[in-house]
């Protein structure tokens, strides 16, 4: 995957396709949820940073058994350069806090659609 | 359902303000740009700019830059478009759309808003 | 700003005929080209998004094709319910804008 770099500030150029279709699925996810997400599950929040996908997977890796966050922690391992596996982590979490993947879902959602608005919404 | 409602027609002396207010239901407001389009007699579809209701962001078409204001009240889920200084070309019928981001397209529209500016 | 180019302006055609509808982006605009329909009083209807994606309830007689700067909407057998004005959007970069129309009459 390429065309990700100066993500933080898009200017007028709408995202690649694989970030387009990141987004949608992160729509798909929480338009669609009708029981808890996922059983429910916890997962380490996370700073919304540069390095947010790679550490959006690391905590999304951990759920396991769960079909609806598949697609998504497939699309995210295609914007993280390096291999990542359950029990990882990085210095982008925050290692107190534990939410459930519904709202980090709409968190990481909320924070990319925020991202392509910069530079269009003053 | 989604549903955009709008205000209804209004007519107006050249120099007047209109205020155009767009109700929406069915979906999470603040989840979704509001846009507002306009279409004069006989004419095609121009885009007039863009409010995030979250953050009360605003983007707007050049051509209406200064005469146009576009706000947000989330308590009742209303979007409003405000144009001041009135024309005769300003005559058309005013449409808000929604958008989930700018680049999407617009899926769900108001009935439009005929403005009409005569002396 | 990127301009749209409709053409032709009026397609006379008749029912049961194939409709084809052209968009030309004064600038690559990828895929990000949405179509819409307008019937007289009524507001545009969303047909086609990202230049090819069909949407749910719209007839598959309509589809779109394209990238780039050349779009085409087709509508492969008109139904006396498809002789509207059809418009195309830049969903690239604001300003938005919008093709100046193609009206599909009955001949």
């Known amino acids: 995957l390429t065309c990700l770099g100066g993500f933080a500030s898009p200017g007028p150029v709408p995202p690649s396709t694989a970030l387009r279709e990141l987004i949608e699925e992160l729509v798909n996810i929480t338009q669609n949820q009708k029981a808890p997400l996922c059983n429910g599950s916890m997962v380490w929040s996370i700073n919304l940073t540069a390095g947010m996908y790679c550490a959006a997977l690391e905590s999304l890796i951990n759920v396991s058994g769960c079909s609806a966050i598949e697609k998504t922690q497939r699309m995210l391992s295609g914007f993280c350069p390096h291999k990542v596996s359950a029990g990882q982590f990085s210095s982008l979490h925050v290692r107190d806090t534990k939410i459930e993947v519904a709202q980090f879902v709409k968190d990481l959602l909320l924070h990319l659609k925020k991202l392509f608005r910069e530079g269009q919404f003053n | 359902q989604v549903q955009l409602v709008q205000s209804g027609a209004e007519v107006k002396k050249p120099g007047a303000s209109v205020k155009v207010s767009c109700k929406a239901s069915?979906?999470?407001?603040?989840?979704?740009?509001i846009h507002w389009v306009r279409q004069a007699p006989g004419q095609g579809l121009e885009w007039m700019g863009a409010?995030?209701?979250?953050?009360?962001?605003?983007a707007y078409n050049q051509k209406f830059k200064g005469r146009v204001t576009m706000t947000t009240d989330t308590s009742t889920s209303t979007a409003y478009m405000e144009l001041r200084s009135l024309r005769s070309d300003d005559t058309a019928v005013y449409y808000c759309?929604?958008?989930?981001?700018?680049?999407?397209?617009?899926?769900?529209w108001g009935q439009g808003t005929l403005v009409t500016v005569s002396s | 700003e990127i301009v749209l180019t409709q053409s032709p302006a009026t397609l006379s055609l008749s029912p049961g005929e194939r409709a084809t509808l052209s968009c030309r982006a004064s600038?690559?605009?990828?895929?990000?080209l949405h179509w819409y329909q307008q019937k007289p009083g009524q507001a545009p209807r969303l047909l086609i998004y990202?230049?090819?994606q069909s949407i749910s309830g719209i007839p598959a007689r309509f589809s779109g094709s394209g990238s780039g700067t050349d779009f085409t909407l087709t509508i492969s057998s008109l139904e006396p319910e498809d002789f509207a004005v059809y418009y195309c959007?830049?969903?690239?970069?604001?300003?938005?804008?919008f093709g100046g129309g193609t009206k599909v009459e009955i001949k």
């Open positions: 759309t929604r958008i989930l981001l700018y680049y999407y397209p617009m899926d769900y």
């Open positions: 069915g979906y999470t407001f603040i989840d979704y740009e």
């Open positions: 409010i995030d209701p979250e953050t009360g962001g605003t």
């Open positions: 600038q690559n605009i990828s895929d990000y």
């Open positions: 990202y230049a090819s």
């Open positions: 959007q830049n969903g690239h970069s604001f300003p938005l804008t």
